[in-house]
């Protein structure tokens, strides 16, 4: 659909879900809520020192499936889980960090809970 | 089509709670938000919150949360908001609003309180 | 929260004329993930509940006359009624629904001579 000017509505329209965010809060989010078309997601990965870090947010529909896809990088340890089966969903999700391994993986299973 | 039907009007005597109900029809009541909207006579609106009947989450406008609860009966596709300690400021129309993004597009009649002794 | 201003508060026009009406928001609604603004036009008839006109700034409803104009971005919107009916005789409120609480402005009385 167009957004400049004459476009009619349309259908089905998806209903909005609220997820919870945390170190990945868009500016429009209020007492760590977010919003989104999409999924809610908990992630899991290593940072520059080695410690972990969990980041949760909304993923818009656009993309996420893949986003959601948890496929292995390269010297990387990071896992991803996304939920859209009610709000704030992602709440309840506890990714672990992957074991290290030294062959790279190509393509992973896509983790929605 | 998709309906919101609401009570015309509400009399209620200050201190007093009130229930007020809106029964959805024509579409699937779990998946659109449904959201309450106060106006009073010659003023804008206000937005009090929304529930989303599937798993009924709310949001509420901290200006009235101390005022207002929102619920819902799935079995008969009803929301309901309650409001407790009504004084004089409470007289309003209050309706209720679907929404499936955060925009509404569709509406109740309203339902007129009054809260007077 | 989000501070909506609607202006002029009345207006007077004949049928036929083209009406323009203004909402100015405190922050920007456009969302810089989809580049869409979060807002939506009312349409409130003596008596009646209030109907939805156009939403996402400039997408119009299924249904609503093609006479309605949305436009505007950031901070700065209009609705305009290229040539104005009887029938459009009305209150006319934006709301926003970037961030909650959803906030609307104080509305525009259209009257008709």
């Known amino acids: 659909k167009k957004e400049d000017g004459e476009s009619t509505a349309p259908t089905p329209r998806p209903k909005i879900l609220r997820c919870k965010c945390h170190h990945h809060c868009p500016e429009d989010s209020v007492n760590n809520i977010c919003s989104t078309d999409g999924y809610c997601f908990t992630m899991i990965e290593e940072d520059d020192s080695g410690m972990p870090v969990v980041t949760s947010g909304c993923l818009g529909l656009e993309g996420s499936d893949f986003q959601c896809r948890d496929t292995p990088i390269p010297h990387q340890r990071r896992s991803i889980e996304c939920c859209t089966e009610r709000n704030e969903c992602n709440k309840d999700l506890h990714p672990t960090l992957p074991p290290l391994k030294n062959r790279d993986f190509v393509d992973g299973p896509i983790h929605h809970k | 089509q998709v309906q919101l039907q609401q009570p015309g009007a509400e009399l209620v005597m200050p201190g007093a709670s009130v229930k007020l109900s809106c029964k959805a029809s024509?579409?699937?009541?779990?998946?659109?938000?449904m959201h309450w909207v106060k106006q009073r006579p010659g003023q804008g609106l206000e937005w009090i919150g929304e529930i989303d009947p599937s798993d009924v989450y709310t949001t509420y406008n901290q200006k009235f949360k101390d005022k207002a609860t929102l619920t819902v009966d799935k079995s008969s596709s009803t929301a309901y908001m309650q409001l407790i300690n009504l004084t004089s400021e409470d007289s309003a129309v209050y309706y209720c609003a679907r929404s499936g993004w955060d925009y509404f597009d569709y509406w109740g009649q309203g339902t007129a309180l009054t809260v007077s002794s | 929260d989000i501070v909506m201003t609607q202006s002029p508060s009345s207006l007077a026009m004949s049928v036929g004329q083209k009406v323009t009406m203004s909402c100015k928001s405190s922050?920007?609604?456009?969302?810089?993930?989809?580049?869409?603004?979060?807002l939506a036009w009312y349409q409130q008839k003596p008596g009646q509940s209030p109907k939805l006109l156009v939403y996402f700034a400039s997408t119009r409803e299924s249904g609503v006359p093609d006479r309605f104009i949305g436009s505007g971005s950031g901070t700065d919107f209009t609705l305009t009624i290229s040539s104005v009916q009887a029938e459009d005789l009305a209150d006319y409120f934006c709301q926003q629904y970037y961030s909650t609480p959803w906030t609307f402005g104080g509305g525009t009385k259209l009257e008709i001579k």
């Open positions: 922050q920007s609604l456009l969302k810089s993930n989809n580049q869409k603004n979060y």
């Open positions: 024509g579409y699937t009541f779990t998946n659109y938000w």
